[in-house]
């Protein structure tokens, strides 16, 4: 599980996998979190040791048992990796260190007026990893207000020295604050040249890109597919850099895929984990454990829960199965990537979700959210199924949310169409985050058919569900993807990680929000919910969510949008935002249409002529 405690005056003995210099224990912990093998760390502040070479030393450690003996060392700080800690996992580090010079390769010097300006320059420079700034009181006049942009082979300082009137810090590119912008394109049949900084095996170019994004010196990559002509190079992901920051040349090459690090993306970074499961693929590596489980999703969950597990293979070979359970091979390697990838097997493979930062936070404390009501801004690609239902009469305005459940299907609330049943007036925007980004040129979907539940009555809370068939199917992208639906009559699953999203009012008498808001809300039992609504019947076709103290809730404009819950590493559409007594009121949970109760209806309405369901359902 997630262990956040720090141990003062303690040093873990043994287990070393890497060492580096970091300015404080928190940065050391972050490096441990992102290191594939690190479970524990020990940090030596300048005050804790006389040996100049070991000052600011950050020692990353691994242990088969998950722990190591602690020895007393005055001033030392030790702790755990934040793997499995959900929202606490972040490569973003904003702190500025006064009286400290972080050494590295100085590749750019300029005069600036403040340390913040220096940090901004570093963030906006593709090669800058960290910086030092000499203040106006620095002892050598010619160096005052100098901003030195730096990098190093490992992304951390090559040394850290105590030096008066110098301030240092890190690039804020991992905070998605770079002004550079990024190249999302993946280039098929193209190989990039330049310097290889690392070589790993990956099942596809997307995993390769994520690894590149979180590698300190990778600016772009080339991936050799599993049909590449040289067998020994198949599935090789080459992480690359160059002096200029861009490839100096590219060569057309069959069965190669190239692309760029997404570290310079302005709005959001990809999660530092790989959630996709690869059927018919085996991942080779060092065996950690073998266990019998029911289904590949449980295998992935087992790997995620076993903190040292990096990736897994779920075997469907008859000799590896008994009854409904099959062997789940939990594996690891030195670099966190498989040592061998085999295709055409009877296995399914994937990665641990231990670094997913939208993971289930029930295991450890989370960074608190502050506004939907009481929510926070969402980031790009976080809720790719969320759509905005807008009406264009004289002006155009957002009225409701909805959820993409298939290429041509959106699920929403029936009450969104009260008084507006004409399909021509509606415009559906998908793959967006900011409503202000919508212009007359922004593509939108039109409605082919509105299917309102036959038992829904205007101004009543019952059967508040509707399907929208789009005129043309949508392509799936990282920002526009369907949400899986629950299984019919899903009553046994206990959901503990549920979120509501929308552009709705941020207070009861508020206004539509520009940035898509998200709020983490606990489910409330129907029995408890019923007690809070003295005059309305809470049926088994409804689900309630809210905090006892109120303060966080869906509101006007969120209607029709999703209540999604993450279970076994998969997001599911549990509810459709429907109604409530006001917004975020104390003891008045929001009421949502329970999607599981309408699965027969959804399946019936979305059946195509060839009898295949046209929406996303969990495997």
């Amino acid at each position: 599980g997630c262990l956040t405690q720090l141990y003062e005056n303690a040093f873990f003995r043994g287990g070393d996998v890497a060492s580096m210099y970091t300015p404080n224990a928190q940065y050391c912990q972050m490096r441990c979190t992102f290191h594939p093998r690190c479970l524990l760390f020990s940090f030596l502040p300048a005050s804790s040791i006389n040996d100049m070479e070991k000052r600011f030393g950050c020692f990353l450690k691994d242990s088969v048992t998950g722990t190591l003996p602690k020895v007393h060392r005055t001033g030392a700080v030790s702790g755990h990796s934040l793997k499995q800690c959900g929202h606490q996992i972040s490569a973003c580090h904003r702190d500025i260190y006064k009286g400290v010079d972080m050494r590295g390769v100085n590749f750019n010097v300029s005069k600036v007026s403040s340390v913040e300006e220096c940090q901004k320059r570093c963030t906006s420079n593709i090669r800058c990893q960290f910086f030092s700034y000499a203040t106006q009181t620095f002892h050598k006049a010619e160096y005052r207000n100098n901003c030195l942009l730096k990098y190093s082979p490992g992304g951390t300082p090559t040394a850290i020295k105590v030096l008066s009137n110098v301030e240092s810090g890190f690039s804020l590119k991992p905070c998605a604050l770079s002004e550079i912008g990024c190249h999302m394109n993946i280039f098929q049949h193209l190989a990039f040249s330049d310097v290889d900084v690392a070589r790993v095996l990956t099942p596809d170019a997307f995993v390769c890109r994520t690894i590149c994004t979180y590698h300190p010196n990778c600016l772009f990559f080339t991936f050799y597919t599993n049909v590449w002509k040289i067998e020994s190079q198949r599935n090789v992901c080459l992480l690359k850099t160059s002096e200029s920051g861009t490839p100096s040349s590219s060569t057309p090459q069959e069965n190669t895929i190239s692309g760029y690090s997404l570290l310079t993306c302005k709005r959001t970074l990809p999660e530092p984990c790989h959630s996709k499961i690869y059927p018919g693929v085996d991942f080779g590596g060092e065996e950690l454990n073998v266990t019998f489980v029911k289904g590949v999703n449980v295998c992935q969950e087992t790997c995620t829960k076993m903190i040292r597990c990096q990736f897994f293979t779920y075997s469907l070979l008859p000799e590896d199965c008994k009854e409904e359970k099959c062997k789940c091979f939990l594996r690891l390697s030195m670099d966190g990537s498989p040592t061998r990838i085999a295709y055409g097997t009877q296995g399914s493979s994937g990665y641990s979700l231990r670094l997913c930062n939208t993971g289930d936070n029930s295991v450890c404390t989370t960074k608190t959210s502050t506004r939907i009501v009481g929510g926070t801004n969402s980031s790009w690609g976080e809720w790719p199924w969320q759509v905005s239902l807008q009406v264009k009469l004289t002006a155009q305005r957002h009225l409701c949310g909805g959820s993409l459940i298939g290429h041509q299907w959106v699920l929403t609330a029936a009450h969104c169409f009260d008084g507006l049943p004409l399909q021509d007036v509606w415009r559906i925007y998908s793959g967006i985050l900011n409503l202000s980004d919508i212009t007359k040129d922004t593509p939108f979907s039109q409605i082919k058919e509105i299917i309102i539940h036959q038992n829904y009555k205007v101004s009543e809370g019952n059967h508040d569900i509707a399907l929208i068939k789009l005129q043309a199917p949508l392509n799936y992208t990282e920002f526009q993807k369907p949400i899986c639906l629950p299984s019919k009559g899903d009553t046994s699953t206990i959901y503990t990680n549920c979120w509501v999203t929308g552009w709705g009012f941020s207070k009861e008498k508020g206004e539509i929000q520009n940035i898509l808001q998200k709020v983490n809300i606990p489910l409330v039992t129907n029995e408890e919910c019923q007690k809070r609504y003295q005059d309305y019947k809470i049926t088994q076709r409804m689900v309630c969510a809210g905090y006892k103290e109120g303060g966080k809730d869906a509101c006007k404009g969120d209607s029709g949008g999703p209540l999604v819950c993450k279970h076994n590493g998969m997001w599911r559409l549990v509810g459709i935002t429907s109604w409530g007594e006001g917004c975020a009121r104390r003891e008045q949970p929001g009421v949502y249409t329970k999607v599981a109760e309408y699965m027969d209806w959804i399946l019936e309405k979305t059946q195509s002529s060839d009898g295949k369901a046209q929406m996303q359902s969990p495997a």
């Epitope: 009555k457 009543e460 809370g461 019952n462 019923q530 007690k531 809070r532 609504y533 003295q534 005059d535 309305y536 019947k537 809470i538 049926t539 003891e587």
Partner: antibody, heavy 116, light 106 residues
């Protein structure tokens, strides 16, 4: 306007049964619960039970299980309370009420007198 | 079974008085208590639910408070139309009424 119209007063003999009705207007009984409450002369209120007319699910006060039977007819938007094996203890006003978590709107009540 | 003990059973007060009625539950009822007003020959009327939430249309002189097992209904400025019988109701576990408090003119 939400209204619950209860049937008229009943004078019944001990040991007999009686069926009281509660007809709703201004709302559909399927969308709510119908509760029944008893009030003996000059005494307090006692909850009898609750029916969900949509699926005929019922809940009763354990103390009076068997005495009362709740039913509903959604086509006529009417709920019923059947009382059996009547004794003088059952002489009371019987109220129907609609609501969710509790009784929000009440009918005018039906007086049942049990007398030989 | 949860028992509700209401007190006093009756009280005399004058217009303008502040009147307090209490209800004690035999177990913690998680604030799930409601208060009803009943006038002779009429059906009860919901005043307050969830300890302190005023039902719409009910004058603000009525207020509820309490937690755990002890709850109070307060009428801050008694009006002529407030002379009636008041009942508490727990709805945490099924439904149980208190015995009632008759508020009479002094």
């Amino acid at each position: 306007e939400v209204q619950l119209q209860q049937s008229g007063a009943e004078l019944v003999k001990p040991g007999a049964s009686v069926r009281l009705s509660c007809t709703a207007s201004g709302f559909n009984i399927k969308d709510t619960y119908i509760f029944w409450v008893k009030q003996r002369p000059k005494q307090g209120l006692e909850w009898i039970g609750r029916i969900d007319p949509e699926n005929d699910n019922t809940k009763y006060d354990p103390k009076i299980q068997g005495k009362a039977t709740l039913t509903a007819d959604t086509s006529s938007n009417t709920a019923y309370l059947q009382l059996s094996s009547l004794t003088s203890e059952d002489s009371a006003i019987y109220y129907c009420a609609k609501g969710g978590g509790l009784f929000a709107y009440w009918g005018q009540g039906t007086l049942v007198s049990v007398s030989a | 079974d949860i028992q509700m003990t209401q007190s006093p059973s009756s009280l005399s007060a004058s217009v303008g008085d502040r009147v307090t009625i209490t209800c004690e539950a035999s177990h913690d009822i998680n604030n799930y208590i409601a208060w009803y007003q009943q006038k002779p020959g009429k059906a009860p009327k919901l005043l307050i639910y969830y300890t302190s939430t005023l039902q719409s249309g009910v004058p603000s002189r009525f207020s509820g408070s309490g937690s755990g097992t002890e709850f109070t209904l307060t009428i801050s400025n008694l009006q002529p139309e407030d002379f009636a019988t008041y009942y508490c109701l727990q709805y945490d576990n099924l439904f149980t009424f208190g015995q009632g408090t008759k508020v009479e003119i002094k």
